[in-house]
């Protein structure tokens, strides 16, 4: 019974259960391909438990291996949009600190209006994740169509 | 050593490890866009540990944040079929209780025959998840092509 | 405090936190549709904590329910390429021991150049997972475009 009690008494953060699910706030101005995210119960079903938002980008607070997942749906899309503006690409990566900058996950919209994927990756406290959408396409802000999240899996 | 022993002695359900992976049973009658699911070791590799099925829909038994994932493949499909009948749309949502009804995840088959995605979302005991497939194309019942599951992640 | 200490003192493997994320090494010779994987910190962001590689295929070391995920991007590809060479199909399955051989997850590239999906499935110690890519198109070896991983979820 002791474990169950300990589990309840310790703050969840100390168990390493960092998790976040974000919804799209807005796209960047010209020359800024980043998507800007928001999260919190007041906004609906998005949340941050551990990680934080820094100017719309997700910052990691705990070292570990994370499952990173994303879905982006285009609000302005055509059967030829994806191929005409090709390659319209979504990339998720560590954008700061600069010394750790790397692309983690990349997908193109090939005659499709939605991309979705996920992967496991090591992240460190202070890593900021950016999601770059290249091309002149506008993502949907519907919370069931466009979302981005991370889940701490293990140290 | 105490933790390892405690972990083995306590029933897994008390650790909050609710998880389910379902396979397609059948589609609904006309005017009912829902997919009806089934699960259990007798059926193959599907299972329910915690959540339950209620008339083919998945009912949650434990409050928490869940990873919800789905893949649906259309049975009689080619790129041209998909675009002609397009957009066949799949939506996963809470359908009961009515007071909590909301769409959690939505995808269209855009000149493609498979959609797959996943997301983190808070769910409460008693929430029933429905998967609605709108359009005239039939989903495959192959267990490696069409499946739906949830995994409890944290309180 | 006792639980937190116990958690740190016990080897992670004893907590059942088996996890792996692999990057593509190479494709097989003719008549061998398997993708050959590699992993380890020296290679970048791939890793194996628990599972092992056996001639480029992933072997499971702990019984349990796993989340299996994969993304494969075709290297020389356009919407028309994908449909012209259609059906290029990716299947993830247990390939040994032969008695447990089964397809777990299957996807086709329909006018698209990337597939990504995930599913929960029971796996047993000794199961070897193979990823078969049928068709004449080559997968990208970029680590942000093609990857394959598993995460132990519960016993």
């Amino acid at each position: 019974q002791r474990f169950a009690q300990a589990q309840q008494q310790l703050p969840l953060e100390s168990l390493g259960w960092d998790v976040a699910e974000l919804q799209l706030n807005h796209t960047g101005p010209q020359q800024d391909p980043r998507l800007y995210w928001q999260g919190g119960p007041a906004l609906g079903r998005s949340f941050l438990h551990g990680p934080e938002l820094d100017k719309g980008q997700l910052r990691i607070h705990r070292d570990g291996i994370y499952m990173v997942h994303i879905q982006v749906t285009l609000a302005i899309c055509s059967s030829t949009t994806a191929s005409r503006h090709h390659p319209t690409t979504l990339a998720v990566g560590i954008c700061s600190p600069a010394s750790r900058s790397i692309s983690l996950l990349r997908l193109s919209f090939h005659q499709g209006c939605t991309i979705a994927s996920q992967r496991l990756t090591p992240l460190a406290r202070g890593d900021t994740l950016c999601t770059n959408l290249t091309g002149t396409l506008l993502p949907s802000r519907n919370t069931d169509e466009t979302f981005f999240g991370v889940q701490w899996v293990r140290p | 050593q105490r933790f390892a022993q405690a972990q083995q002695q306590l029933p897994l359900e008390s650790l909050g490890w609710d998880v389910a992976e379902l396979q397609l049973n059948h589609t609904g009658p006309q005017q009912d866009p829902r997919l009806y699911w089934q699960g259990g070791p007798a059926l193959g590799r599907s299972f329910l540990h915690g959540p339950e099925l209620d008339k083919g829909q998945l009912r949650i038994h434990r409050d928490g944040i869940y990873m919800v994932h789905i893949q649906v493949t259309l049975a009689i499909c080619s790129s041209t079929t998909a675009s002609r009948h397009h957009p066949t749309t799949l939506a996963v949502g809470i359908c009961s209780p009515a007071s909590r009804s909301i769409s959690l995840l939505r995808l269209s088959f855009h000149q493609g025959c498979t959609i797959a995605s996943q997301r983190l979302t808070p769910l409460a005991r008693g929430d029933t998840l429905c998967t609605n497939l709108t359009g005239t194309l039939l989903p495959s019942r192959n267990t490696d092509e069409t499946f739906f599951g949830v995994q409890w992640v944290r309180p | 405090q006792r639980f937190a200490q116990a958690q740190q003192q016990l080897p992670l493997e004893s907590l059942g936190w088996d996890v792996a994320e692999l990057q593509l090494n190479h494709t097989g010779p003719q008549q061998d549709p398997r993708l050959y994987w590699q992993g380890g910190p020296a290679l970048g962001r791939s890793f194996l904590h628990g599972p092992e590689l056996d001639k480029g295929q992933l072997r499971i070391h702990r019984d349990g329910i796993y989340m299996v995920h994969i993304q494969v991007t075709l290297a020389i590809c356009s919407s028309t390429t994908a449909s012209r060479h259609h059906p290029t199909t990716l299947a993830v399955g247990i390939c040994s021991p032969a008695s447990r051989s089964i397809s777990l997850l299957r996807l086709s590239f329909h006018q698209g150049c990337t597939i990504a999906s995930q599913r929960l499935t029971p796996l047993a110690r000794g199961d070897t997972l193979c990823t078969n890519l049928t068709g004449t198109l080559l997968p990208s070896r970029n680590t942000d475009e093609t990857f394959f991983g598993v995460q132990w979820v519960r016993p």
Partner: antibody
Framework: EVQLLESGGGLVQPGGSLRLSCAAS????????MSWVRQAPGKCLEWVSA????????FYAESVQGRFTISRDNSKNTLYLQVNSLRAEDTAVYYC?????????????WGQGTLVTVSS | EIVLTQSPGTLSLSPGERATLSCRAS???????LAWYQQKPGQAPRLLIY???SRATGIPDRFSGSGSGTDFTLTISRLEPEDFAVYYC?????????FGCGTKVEIK
Amino acid sequence: EVQLLESGGGLVQPGGSLRLSCAASGFTFSSYAMSWVRQAPGKCLEWVSAISGSGGSTFYAESVQGRFTISRDNSKNTLYLQVNSLRAEDTAVYYCARHDYSNYPYFDYWGQGTLVTVSS
Amino acid sequence: EIVLTQSPGTLSLSPGERATLSCRASQSVRGNYLAWYQQKPGQAPRLLIYGASSRATGIPDRFSGSGSGTDFTLTISRLEPEDFAVYYCQQYGYSPFTFGCGTKVEIK
């Protein structure tokens, strides 16, 4: 109260140019994608162009691609449409319209329109 | 591009009657992303329905939308005097975003 007020229309010769403006008030302008939609006398509505809330992405109907340019100044809460190389078939009432918050181009608020007449 | 065909061109009805307006697409509309607007002479269009069946803010419940794929319907359950106008459907699933040419609902 959301308000959209177009201006800048008028009579112009074929090949000529105009700059249409749309002054917005009553909402956070930079949070919304905007479009121009036109309606020729007695004809159907036709979507012309769209721009994201930040101004970073622009979209055009094929009939105006290369001739029209959409832009916005979020500091002035104003949407613009620069129309060049005008043709007789561009004669229409031009409406500015706000996209739904989702960014999808269905239009929850419209201006009253400004008439552009292309004639020699 | 997706062509939207509205029928009938004109609908002559009396107040209190039920109006059924049809909009047919030349190909399936992605996500059932179809909207309905009302336009009165000299005025801008007004959004009634989006997503084929969701009523816009402030729209009376006598207006309802239905349909999916290629066939969509706007129903006005009991016509009020202020409902006599031209009604347009619009698909916004794929660019270019196209409108039907309207159904005029006039007093019989």
